[in-house]
């Protein structure tokens, strides 16, 4: 941009600087040259000489008009055509921006990551503001009324050693350019209700020999929670079908899941827990794929039989994703939920 | 309640440095975000640096690359750090609670002098 330039005169933009995409703008330049009165005065736009809507105001004084200006940035200068000089002589020059007020901040969550060692606070901004938006965090304890202020931009980590005064807190995000300010709702939150387990993993996976073979998954997590609740999501590669089975886990000891399953087939395994009776979820773990083995003599395989579980299982629901384009977005097909919690939340689908 | 103080104020030549201080009490300093203010003679609040609880630094086109702004949690002092001063600082600053933005100030001190002048 023009930002250290040695002007011989003046430009100004009404309604300023930075205005509102789509606005009518005006521009003035006004020379202030020794030994030179102008023929004309031009006005360049990003290096490009402008050709309409220009109007000379008076000797000194000239303004162009910009109808609907909507380009984000733009870098304005203009010069002066003086009697007997070959090249134009340099005016002034500005940088220019156009863009919206921000949004009101949405979906503000706030989670703690076992271990982590930080609260962290995400939310959507919103549409594109186009120029600099601030995103100030406010988090105020309902205990000592103190208040705490973060700068962000979409996201924030809050150490919980800054959390130590009190347990409930109000969090809420500001945003902030120079053509506007929203605040989003502000979110109630208990450091204990927050907590996400330590991640969760599928280590491996086996299929037994038995005359009915079942496929045993192995899992773990370093958590430190006693209540944890956790899903387990499997599907064949090749179907857009999710099963979900549910279980109530201790991981003193690492976990073993019994299913079975189809023969000679190849299955996408994923697991995800949150504390029981809280509403925070861990993502969904790495797939895991697993082989199952080709069937050994004639067996009368159903795959609708209740599939047995080392853990208490509630139930078996099915999710499928609406489209290979789409992998996020989940829909439920099927479903009996016990525990009153959607089993769709949070998917992050693999084909 | 909360108290803020200035100083360190002064005259000083163009091109010269300063170090402002801001003695801070009535509330926890350490989680706390702080800015530095100023205004100019028949001039408005103008922001010219703020910290927030997490350290995190910010500063006005007007002032980047000659201030620091700097948060004692042990001394419970705010600084300000200000180098290769020009003509235009000449202002009364203030060191205030809150971030520079957002009508988020919550007070502010007395403020201290600043006068650049040859």
């Known amino acids: 941009g023009i930002t250290s330039i040695n002007c011989s005169g003046d430009m100004w933009v009404e309604p300023g600087e930075i205005f509102q995409m789509g606005m009518n703008v005006s521009i003035y330049c006004q020379e202030a040259l020794k030994h030179c009165r102008p023929r004309n005065l031009y006005f360049y736009k990003n290096g490009f000489k402008e050709e309409f809507d220009i109007t000379r105001i008076n000797r000194t004084t000239a303004r162009i008009w910009y109808k609907g200006f909507s380009e984000p940035h733009a870098y304005m200068h203009c010069t002066a055509e003086c009697p007997g000089h070959f090249q134009e002589t340099l005016i002034c020059g500005k940088d220019i921006s156009s863009g919206h007020p921000p949004d009101a901040p949405s979906n503000l969550t706030c989670v703690i990551y076992e271990y982590s060692g930080n609260m962290t606070c995400t939310w959507n901004t919103g549409k594109p503001t186009y120029i600099d938006t601030k995103y100030i965090v406010h988090v105020k304890s309902l205990e000592t009324e103190e208040e705490q202020q973060y700068l962000a931009s979409s996201y924030v980590k809050i150490s919980t050693d800054s959390l130590q005064g009190s347990r409930k807190y109000l969090v809420w995000v500001q945003a902030v350019n120079s053509l506007g300010m929203e605040n989003s709702q502000q979110l109630h939150v208990h450091l204990d209700d927050i907590v996400i387990p330590s991640a969760s993993i599928i280590s491996r996976a086996e299929t037994t020999n038995d005359t009915v073979p079942k496929t045993i998954v192995y899992w773990k997590s370093k958590t430190m929670i006693e209540k944890v609740f956790c899903e387990m999501r499997y599907k064949t590669t090749t179907n857009q079908t999710w099963s979900v089975k549910e279980f109530d886990a201790n991981f003193t000891y690492v976990q073993q899941s019994e299913f079975y399953l189809e023969p000679d087939s190849k299955y996408v395994f994923q697991v995800r827990c949150q504390e029981t009776g809280k509403r925070n979820w861990q993502p969904w773990s790495s797939p895991f794929v697993h082989q199952t083995s080709q069937e050994t003599g004639k067996r009368n395989w159903q795959p609708w039989s209740s599939p047995f579980v080392h853990q208490t299982s509630q139930t078996v629901s099915q999710v499928t994703a609406k489209s290979s384009h789409e992998p996020q977005k989940m829909e439920m097909l099927s479903a009996t939920i016990f525990r009153g919690h959607p089993a769709s939340g949070n998917h992050q689908d693999i084909g | 309640q909360v108290q803020l103080q200035e100083s360190g104020g002064g005259l000083v030549q163009p091109g010269g440095s300063l170090r402002l201080s801001c003695a801070a009490s009535?509330?926890?300093?350490?989680?706390?975000?702080m800015t530095w203010v100023r205004q100019a003679p028949g001039k408005g609040l103008d922001w010219v640096s703020g910290?927030?609880?997490?350290?995190?630094?910010v500063y006005a086109d007007s002032v980047k690359g000659r201030a620091t702004i700097l948060k004692d949690n042990a001394k419970n002092t705010l600084y300000l750090q200000m180098n290769s001063l020009k003509t235009e600082d000449t202002a009364v600053y203030y060191c205030?609670?809150?971030?520079?933005?957002?009508?988020?100030?919550?007070?502010r001190g007395q403020g201290t002098q600043v006068t650049v002048s040859s």
């Open positions: 910290i927030d609880s997490g350290g995190t630094t």
């Open positions: 205030a609670t809150g971030l520079p933005w957002g009508n988020t100030w919550r007070t």
């Open positions: 009535g509330f926890t300093f350490s989680s706390s975000a």
